[in-house]
C-alpha cells in the first residue's frame, strides 16, 4: 500500500486525482489499489513505458486537458482491468500501434479534441469489447478500411469534426452493433451507395455540416431501427423518391441549409413519430399535394427561407396534428382558398416576408383555434370581409408593412381593427398607404371621408392578462414561426446546434458540457 | 444568474382549477423548450408537459391530456401550467424546468425551479 | 411509451466505495438518456447527458455510458454528500419518461 502522492489527492485510496501545472510526469507512488485515476490540466507531455504498472485495478483513467504529445507503446501495459480510458483533449498526432493491447475489458476510449491525423486498423484490432470510440476534434482526413473490423461490439462511434473528405462503403460494415454514427463537421462530399447497410441497430446517425450533394436512393434502407438523422448543413439538391420511405422509427429530422429545390409527394414515407420538420434555409419552390401526407403525427413544419412561390391546394393534405406552420420568407403571392382546411389543429401561422397581394376569404375557414397569425410586410392593400371574424382564440395578429389600400372599402377592416386592438401588439401598426394624402396614417384611426356602411362587427371575447403567444423578434428558426429577426447560422446544427466549437455546443441554448460525444 | 421560480401552487378541491406560473431570468426564455415536471409526495419524478420555444409546437403526458394547458408568454419570460379538472392524484410538488434541446442529441433538463407545492384534496 | 426500470431500487454503500445503478430502456433510446440527482426536498440537478457527457460543474467521480437500452451511471468514490437519489430520464421520443430512481444510502 502506497500513500497519496503529494500533488494528487486520494479518496480513501480507491480515486486519485491529480491536477496543476507544476505535474510534469506522472506522480508516484500511486496507491496500488486505486480504481480511478484523473491526470488533468498538467504539463504532463509524454507517457513514458509502464507508468500505471502498479495499479492493475485501475478501471478508469483519465488522462485530459494536458500537454501530452508523445505516448510510448507499453504505456498502458497491466491495466486488464480498465473499462474506461480518456485521452481527450490532449496533443497527440500520432498513437503507436499496440498501445492499447492487452486492454482485454476496455468498453470506453475517449481520444477527441487531439491532433490525430490518421488511424490505422491494427490501433484497435486488440480492443474487442469496445463499446464507445470517441474520435472526434481531430485532423483526420480519411479512414482505412478495416479500422474497424475487431470492433464488433461497438454501439456509439463519433469522428466528427475532423477532415474526412469521403468514407469507404466498407469501412463500417462489420458493425452490426452501432447505435451510434457521429459524422457531423467533416468534408464529405458524398456518402457511397451501401455504406450504412450493415448498421442494422443504427439508431442515431449525424451527417450534418458537411458537403454531401446527392445521397444514394438506398443509402438508409437498411436501417430500420434509425431513430435520429441529421442531414442539415450540407449541400442536398435533391432528395431520391424512397429516401425516407422505410423509417418509420424517425423522430428527429434535420434537412434546413440545403439546397433542396423540390419536394416530390409522399416523399417522407410513413414516420408515426416525427413531430418537429425542418426545412428553412432551402431552395424549395413549390409545394405539391401530398408532399406531406406520411406526417400524421408532425406538429411543427418549417418552411420559411425558401422561394416557395406556389402551394398546391393539397400540399398539407395528412397533417391533422400540425400546430405550427412556418413560410415566412418565401416568394408567395397568392394562396388557394382551401389550402389551410386540412389544419384543424394549427394555432400559429407565419406568413411574413412574402408577396402576398390578396387573400381568399376563407382561407382561415376551418381552422378555428389560430393564435398567431403573422402577415406583416406583404403586399396586401385589403382583406376579405369577416376574414377573422371566427377565430375566437386569436390573440396576436401582425399586418404592419403592407401598403393598406384606405379608401371606403377599408373601413370593416379598419373597424375590426379597432375593436381588435390588443392583438395587433404595440410595437408596430398598419398604415396607410394610399391615397396619398393619408400615406403613413394609422390604419385603425384614419378618417376616411365616406360615410361608413353598416358592418357585423363580432364581439370580441376575454383574453387572460397574459396574451398566449407573445411577439419574440430574435430567437432560433427551428421551432419559430412568430420571429422576423433570426439566425443565420442555425443554432442547432452541430455546433447539436455552425460556428461555435462543439466543447460550446450548447451554448446557444445555454448548455454547458464538460465532455461531448 | 440564470433562476426559474414557480408559484400559484396552494389547496384546491378535487374538480377545481389552478394556474402555476414559472418566472424565468438570467437566460434568453424564447431560445429555450420549457417543461413541467411533477413529483408526488415520496415518489419518483413524472414528465408532465412541455413546450416549444415559440409555443408552437406541445406535448403532455397521457395523464394529464384534456385537463392541463402548457402556454408560454416570451414577452414576460413566462412559462404556465392552467390545471383543470384536478384530482387528488394531482397532489404534488409542480416543477418548472428549462428543456435543453440541441441538434446533436444532447437532451437534459439543465436547469430547475425550486417547486411549487399543489394539494388536491376534499 | 418507453418505460424505464432503475436497479437497485436503493443500496447501501460507504464513503469511499465504487457504486454503479443500471437503467433499462423498453426500446432503444440511441444515447438520448440524461442522469439526475436529487436531494431530499430539493429540485433535481443535472449530471450526465447524451448518456455519457459530465455536465459542466459536476464532480468527475460520476460517469456515465451506455447507448441503446442499457445504461449505467458510476459514482467512482462515494462522497458523504452522494447519499441521495438518482434518476435517469429518456428524451428520444414522448412522453420523456423518468426511472423509478436508486436511493444510495449509508451502510
Known amino acids: 500500500y502506497y500513500g497519496c502522492p503529494s500533488e494528487c489527492t486520494c479518496s480513501r485510496a480507491s480515486q486519485v486525482e491529480c491536477t496543476g501545472a507544476r505535474i510534469v510526469a506522472v506522480p508516484t507512488p500511486l496507491p496500488w489499489n486505486a480504481m480511478s485515476l484523473q491526470i488533468l490540466n498538467t504539463h504532463i507531455t509524454e507517457l513514458s513505458e509502464s507508468p500505471f504498472l502498479n495499479i492493475s485495478a485501475l478501471i478508469a483513467l483519465r488522462i485530459e486537458k494536458n500537454e501530452l504529445s508523445h505516448i510510448m507503446p507499453g504505456a498502458f501495459r497491466n491495466l486488464g482491468s480498465l473499462r474506461y480510458l480518456s485521452l481527450a483533449n490532449n496533443k497527440l498526432q500520432v498513437l503507436p500501434i499496440g498501445l492499447f493491447q492487452g486492454l482485454d475489458s476496455l468498453e470506453s476510449l475517449l481520444l477527441s479534441s487531439n491532433q490525430l491525423v490518421q488511424i490505422q486498423p491494427a490501433h484497435f484490432s486488440q480492443c474487442s469489447n469496445l463499446k464507445e470510440l470517441q474520435l472526434h476534434g481531430n485532423h483526420l482526413e480519411y479512414i482505412p478500411d478495416g479500422a474497424f473490423d475487431h470492433l464488433v461490439g461497438l454501439t456509439k462511434l463519433n469522428l466528427g469534426k475532423n477532415s474526412l473528405t469521403h468514407i469507404s462503403p466498407r469501412v463500417f460494415q462489420h458493425l452490426g452493433n452501432l447505435q451510434v454514427l457521429r459524422l457531423y463537421e467533416n468534408r464529405l462530399t458524398d456518402i457511397p451507395m451501401g455504406t450504412f447497410d450493415g448498421l442494422v441497430n443504427l439508431q442515431e446517425l449525424a451527417l450534418q455540416q458537411n458537403q454531401i450533394g446527392l445521397l444514394s436512393p438506398g443509402l438508409f434502407h437498411n436501417n430500420h431501427n434509425l431513430q435520429r438523422l441529421y442531414l442539415s448543413n450540407n449541400h442536398i439538391s435533391q432528395l431520391p423518391p424512397s429516401i425516407f420511405m422505410q423509417l418509420p422509427q424517425l423522430n428527429r429530422l434535420t434537412l434546413f441549409g440545403n439546397s433542396l429545390k423540390e419536394l416530390s409527394p409522399g416523399i417522407f414515407g410513413p414516420m408515426p413519430n416525427l413531430r418537429e420538420l425542418w426545412l428553412y434555409d432551402n431552395h424549395i419552390t413549390s409545394l405539391p399535394d401530398n408532399v406531406f401526407s406520411n406526417l400524421r403525427q408532425l406538429q411543427v413544419l418549417i418552411l420559411s427561407r425558401n422561394q416557395i412561390s406556389f402551394i398546391s391546394p393539397g400540399a398539407f393534405n395528412g397533417l391533422t396534428e400540425l400546430r405550427e406552420l412556418s413560410l415566412h420568407t418565401n416568394a408567395l403571392q397568392d394562396l388557394d382558398g382551401n389550402v389551410f382546411r386540412m389544419l384543424a389543429n394549427l394555432q400559429n401561422i407565419s406568413l411574413q416576408n412574402n408577396r402576398l397581394r390578396q387573400l381568399p376569404g376563407n382561407i382561415f375557414a376551418n381552422v378555428n383555434g389560430l393564435m398567431t397569425i403573422q402577415l406583416q410586410n406583404n403586399q396586401l392593400e385589403n382583406l376579405p370581409l369577416g376574414i377573422f371574424d371566427h377565430l375566437g382564440k386569436l390573440c396576436e395578429l401582425r399586418l404592419y408593412d403592407n401598403p393598406w389600400r384606405c379608401d371606403s372599402d377599408i373601413l370593416p377592416l379598419r373597424n375590426w381593427l379597432l375593436l381588435n386592438q390588443p392583438r395587433l401588439g404595440t410595437d408596430t401598426v398598419p398604415v396607410c398607404f394610399s391615397p396619398a394624402n393619408v400615406r403613413g396614417q394609422s390604419l385603425i384611426i384614419i378618417n376616411v371621408n365616406v360615410a361608413v356602411p353598416s358592418v357585423h362587427v363580432p364581439e370580441v371575447p376575454s383574453y387572460p392578462e397574459t396574451s398566449w403567444y407573445p411577439d419574440t423578434s430574435s430567437y432560433p428558426d427551428t421551432t419559430s414561426i412568430s420571429s422576423t429577426t433570426e439566425l443565420t447560422s442555425p443554432v442547432e446544427d452541430y455546433t447539436d446546434l455552425t460556428t461555435i466549437q462543439v466543447t460550446d455546443d450548447r451554448s446557444v441554448w445555454g448548455m454547458t458540457q464538460a465532455q461531448s460525444g | 444568474q440564470v433562476q426559474l421560480v414557480e408559484s400559484g401552487g396552494g389547496l384546491v378541491k378535487p374538480g377545481g382549477s389552478l394556474r402555476l406560473s414559472c418566472a424565468a431570468s438570467?437566460?434568453?426564455?424564447?431560445?429555450?423548450?420549457m417543461s413541467w415536471i411533477r413529483q408526488a409526495p415520496r415518489k419518483g419524478l413524472e414528465w408532465v408537459s412541455s413546450?416549444?420555444?415559440?409555443?408552437?409546437?406541445?406535448y403532455y403526458a397521457d395523464s394529464v391530456k384534456g385537463r392541463f394547458s402548457i402556454s408560454r408568454d416570451n414577452a414576460k419570460n413566462s412559462l404556465y401550467l392552467q390545471m383543470n379538472s384536478l384530482r387528488a392524484e394531482d397532489t404534488a410538488v409542480y416543477y418548472c424546468?428549462?428543456?435543453?434541446?440541441?441538434?446533436?442529441?444532447?437532451?437534459?433538463?439543465?436547469?430547475w425551479g425550486q417547486g411549487t407545492m399543489v394539494t388536491v384534496s376534499s | 411509451d418507453i418505460v424505464m426500470t432503475q436497479s437497485p431500487s436503493s443500496l447501501s454503500a460507504s464513503v469511499g466505495d465504487r457504486v454503479t445503478i443500471t437503467c433499462r430502456a423498453s426500446?432503444?433510446?440511441?444515447?438520448?438518456l440524461a442522469w439526475y440527482q436529487q436531494k431530499p426536498g430539493k429540485a433535481p440537478k443535472i449530471l450526465i447527458y447524451?448518456?455519457?457527457s459530465l455536465e459542466s460543474g459536476v464532480p468527475s467521480r460520476f460517469s456515465g455510458s451506455g447507448s441503446g437500452t442499457d445504461f449505467t451511471l458510476t459514482i467512482s468514490s462515494l462522497l458523504p454528500e452522494d447519499f441521495v437519489t438518482y434518476y435517469c430520464?429518456?428524451?428520444?421520443?414522448?412522453?420523456?419518461?423518468f426511472g423509478p430512481g436508486t436511493k444510495v444510502e449509508i451502510k
Open positions: 438570467g437566460f434568453t426564455f424564447s431560445d429555450y423548450y
Open positions: 424546468a428549462r428543456y435543453n434541446w440541441n441538434d446533436r442529441g444532447y437532451d437534459a433538463f439543465d436547469i
Open positions: 413546450i416549444s420555444n415559440s409555443g408552437g409546437a406541445i
Open positions: 430520464q429518456q428524451f428520444n421520443s414522448y412522453p420523456h419518461t
Open positions: 426500446q432503444g433510446i440511441s444515447s438520448a
Open positions: 447524451d448518456a455519457s
